[in-house]
């Protein structure tokens, strides 16, 4: 089948990094500067992504692969292929419509992105607070008095964090 296809379509022989040039009798021509083709048999090359403004070049464009971008310091990537950059906040803050704001009492954020999450409620598990929470750190739950027997585990790790999103304004 491959041999039949290539007899019918000379373009199928053009490798990645080239395009099938209709203006030159369908011969394989190299992709022009600032363009690429990542698969064989293409009739055009795609324009390379330009990482400018808040975007930085993480990987240069080549004749066979597109450029890859990340974000300038103080920002982080969002979306498929880093299609957007969102500003970082400090630990203990979350990004709102009014910019970076401190976590309210009883909530924390230990990252530079995402939302402030409520401290773990130790009493729900029958535990006591071993280490108080802060804006940057969750509480650490310790044993309840009944657990203080030899061989009992002394510290329970906090509950896993919820998926980041944005709390209502």
């Amino acid at each position: 089948f491959e041999r039949t296809r290539s007899l019918q379509d000379p373009c199928s022989n053009c490798p990645a990094g080239t395009f099938c040039d209709n203006n030159r009798n369908q011969i394989c021509s190299p992709c022009p500067p600032n363009s690429f083709s990542s698969a064989g048999g293409q009739r055009t090359c795609d324009i390379c992504r330009q990482c400018k403004g808040v975007f930085r070049t993480r990987k240069e464009c080549s004749s066979t692969s597109n450029a890859e971008c990340d974000c300038t310091p103080g920002f982080h990537c969002l979306g498929a292929g880093c299609s957007m950059c969102e500003q970082d906040c400090k630990q203990g803050q979350e990004l709102t419509k009014k910019g970076c704001k401190d976590c309210c009492f009883g909530t924390f954020n230990d990252q530079k992105r995402g939302i402030c999450r409520p401290w773990t409620n130790c009493s729900l598990d029958g535990k006591s607070v071993l280490v108080n929470g802060t804006k940057e750190r969750d509480v650490v739950c310790g044993p309840s008095p009944a657990d203080l027997s030899p061989g009992a585990s002394s510290v329970t790790p906090p509950a896993p964090a919820r998926e980041p999103g944005h709390s209502p304004q």
Epitope: G53, G79, S83, M84, G165, H166
Partner: nanobody, 123 residues
Framework: EVQLVESGGGLVQPGGSLRLSCAAS????????MTWFRQAPGKGLEWVAH????????YYVDSVEGRFTISRDNANNSLYLQMNSLRAEDTAVYYC????????????????WGQGTTVTVSS
């Protein structure tokens, strides 16, 4: 080509005023939140203000609230930043940026950025 071009920067004395403009082209301007950022010499980028697609919501960083006003003219694909009572600490390169899809609903990511215009506040 999607493009943002800022203008209006310059040298101004403390207490003075400037109006920055941002001309947008290559996309449907009225469909996007728009944002101003700034970068002071030797410092990181700082968010200044942003404005909803129809201009009905505007938000400012605390340090410029009451002194700066963000506005837009969707008919002319233009974004503005009116800066009054300027201070030395407002000295920076000012950039306009386009909010990405879903801006303010699920994130505050930007995807298109201008080249910047320089504001210097000095006596």
């Amino acid at each position: 080509e999607v493009q943002l071009v800022e203008s209006g920067g310059g040298l101004v004395q403390p207490g003075g005023s400037l109006r920055l403009s941002c001309a947008a082209s290559g996309f449907t301007f009225s469909s996007y939140w728009m944002t101003w950022f700034r970068q002071a010499p030797g410092k990181g980028l700082e968010w200044v203000a942003h404005i909803k697609e129809d201009g009905s919501e505007k938000y400012y960083v605390d340090s410029v609230e009451g002194r700066f006003t963000i506005s837009r003219d969707n008919a002319n694909n233009s974004l503005y930043l009116q800066m009054n009572s300027l201070r030395a600490e407002d000295t920076a390169v000012y950039y306009c940026a386009r909010g990405g899809d879903g801006y303010s609903d699920s994130h505050y990511g930007v995807d298109v950025w201008g080249q910047g215009t320089t504001v210097t506040v000095s006596s």
